[in-house]
């Protein structure tokens, strides 16, 4: 939109935002942070949800890929009046709930959670937050935490997937804008191209999947290349190599000319998938060509 970095990944993105009393005078900064970030996830296959928490968790905008609904959701987000306690677990509950519903539909889209809080969680609330974040992970989500001002980094490292999934903002709310680039880079998992994009019918091939964020998985051994053939059968293949910007994968043998395989990637052994508009097609190759 403004020439800044963008993410082309197709996944479900959940913002879980602290709207407790302590952020009352900083809601504008939180809103602008989310707005700037939301506009940089530009895949038509990306869905987004806005969840706020204080003494209760509320889904302000339920999961949608509709850009008009997202625009309206951002308007609602701007109107939020903070107040109440920091029941972060309530926010995670609302995300897990949606992930569960989407999973029950049959097709499992990858989920990324970006949770923002400004305070240290009291011991019991930390326990609940960690438990609910674990439940989100059980459902296939990758969890990032943004900590502003008086946060406890050790706590957030336990709620997030790891300490590498925590974005500390030590200089207060006005410094939130400064982490947009790094959070986008870290949270974005995208498939940009496949080489070759055309393969010979009936022959075995290796495919280089170009993109970003493939090493953001909690365990790179759980990364899979997935090929959805002619919109029906899905074949998962273990990559030979996993690097941040590419995967080297065995391609399935597609017997007939004109068959299409849509490329997807799973970061969690097939529990959920990042979609893309990258297609591999088959062609007839004569002998010696």
């Amino acid at each position: 939109e403004d020439g800044g970095p963008a993410c082309y990944g197709g996944f479900d993105l959940y913002f879980i935002l602290d709207k407790s009393g302590s952020v009352l005078h900083h809601w504008n900064e939180i809103y602008y942070f989310v707005e700037q970030l939301a506009h940089r996830f530009i895949s038509p296959q990306l869905r987004m949800s806005f969840i706020v928490f204080s003494t209760r968790g509320t889904t302000l905008m339920k999961l949608t890929e509709d850009r008009e609904q997202i625009r309206q959701g951002l308007e609602e987000l701007q109107k939020v009046l903070p107040g109440g306690d920091t029941y972060m677990h309530e926010g995670f509950e609302r995300a897990s709930e949606q992930i569960y519903y989407e999973n029950s539909q049959g097709y499992r889209t990858a989920s990324v959670i970006i949770a923002l809080t400004d305070g240290e969680l009291h011991e019991d609330l930390f326990f609940y937050s960690e438990r609910e974040a674990n439940r989100s992970r059980d459902l296939g989500a990758i969890v990032y935490c943004v900590g502003v001002k008086d946060f406890n980094e050790t706590q957030l490292a336990r709620i997030a997937d790891s300490k590498d999934h925590v974005f500390p903002v030590n200089d207060g709310f006005q410094a939130l804008q400064g982490i947009i680039h790094s959070i986008l880079k870290k949270s974005c998992i995208e498939i940009l191209a496949a080489e070759p994009s055309t393969i010979c019918a009936g022959e075995s091939f290796q495919v280089v999947v170009r993109g970003n964020g493939f090493r953001h998985a909690r365990n790179v051994d759980r990364v899979l290349c997935s090929f959805k053939i002619n919109d029906s059968v899905t074949l998962n293949e273990k990559p030979f190599a996993v690097e941040d910007t590419y995967l080297l994968c065995p391609a399935p043998i597609l017997k007939e000319v004109g068959m299409k395989a849509a490329l997807q990637v799973s970061m969690n052994d097939g529990l959920s998938f990042i979609s893309s508009s990258v297609i591999i097609t088959t062609t007839h190759c004569s002998d010696g060509s």
């Epitope: 509320t58 339920k62 509950e93 949606q98 569960y100 999973n103």
Partner: antibody, heavy 117, light 106 residues
Framework: QVQLKESGPALVKPTQTLTLTCTFS??????????VSWIRQPPGKALEWLAH???????SYSTSLKTRLTISKDTSKNQVVLTMTNMDPVDTATYYC?????????WGQGTLVTVSS | DIELTQPPSVSVAPGQTARISCSGD??????VHWYQQKPGQAPVLVIY???KRPSGIPERFSGSNSGNTATLTISGTQAEDEADYYC?????????FGGGTKLTVL
Amino acid sequence: QVQLKESGPALVKPTQTLTLTCTFSGFSLSTSGGGVSWIRQPPGKALEWLAHIYSNDDKSYSTSLKTRLTISKDTSKNQVVLTMTNMDPVDTATYYCARGGYFLDYWGQGTLVTVSS
Amino acid sequence: DIELTQPPSVSVAPGQTARISCSGDNIGGIYVHWYQQKPGQAPVLVIYADSKRPSGIPERFSGSNSGNTATLTISGTQAEDEADYYCQSYDITSLVFGGGTKLTVL
């Protein structure tokens, strides 16, 4: 296909402990995300949720009955067990087990438990 | 926990549209599910996540949720739709049911 079946005593005396077993098939409790709930319904009254056990062994209980309930699972036997202590005639109800996490998509047919001396 | 309030009864003529409400504080910010229960039978899920229909549930069943009210709509109501209907939500690790609505098909 998914099936659940409740079993346990039809008659319980006041102050006794009720033990109910839910035996299920067609899904696994070792799969991420889901779980099994217990719900009851006194004759002619509304549904009341009692307890839930998740695939990762987390448990949740109804706030009003928390002190009297215990839920557990035996993944290898495909069973979930609910115990309810200090039974009272007001606990007379049909007790159901159901599969789900945040909503309940498959239910057992229920078992009627009468509390009477 | 959130409280879900339903009207005790709703009547509808066959072929007409029945609407059953479920109200609660800012219920539009959480998800609501609906169950149908016929006498002597276990409940059956008819709508989940506000508006999604499980397989096998007729298209005449639909759901919506915004503001302080969720609504189950049965268009072209049939005699076999006469039953008790319960709304349900999830709040603070608990499942919460409404008090139920008896739908009478006149």
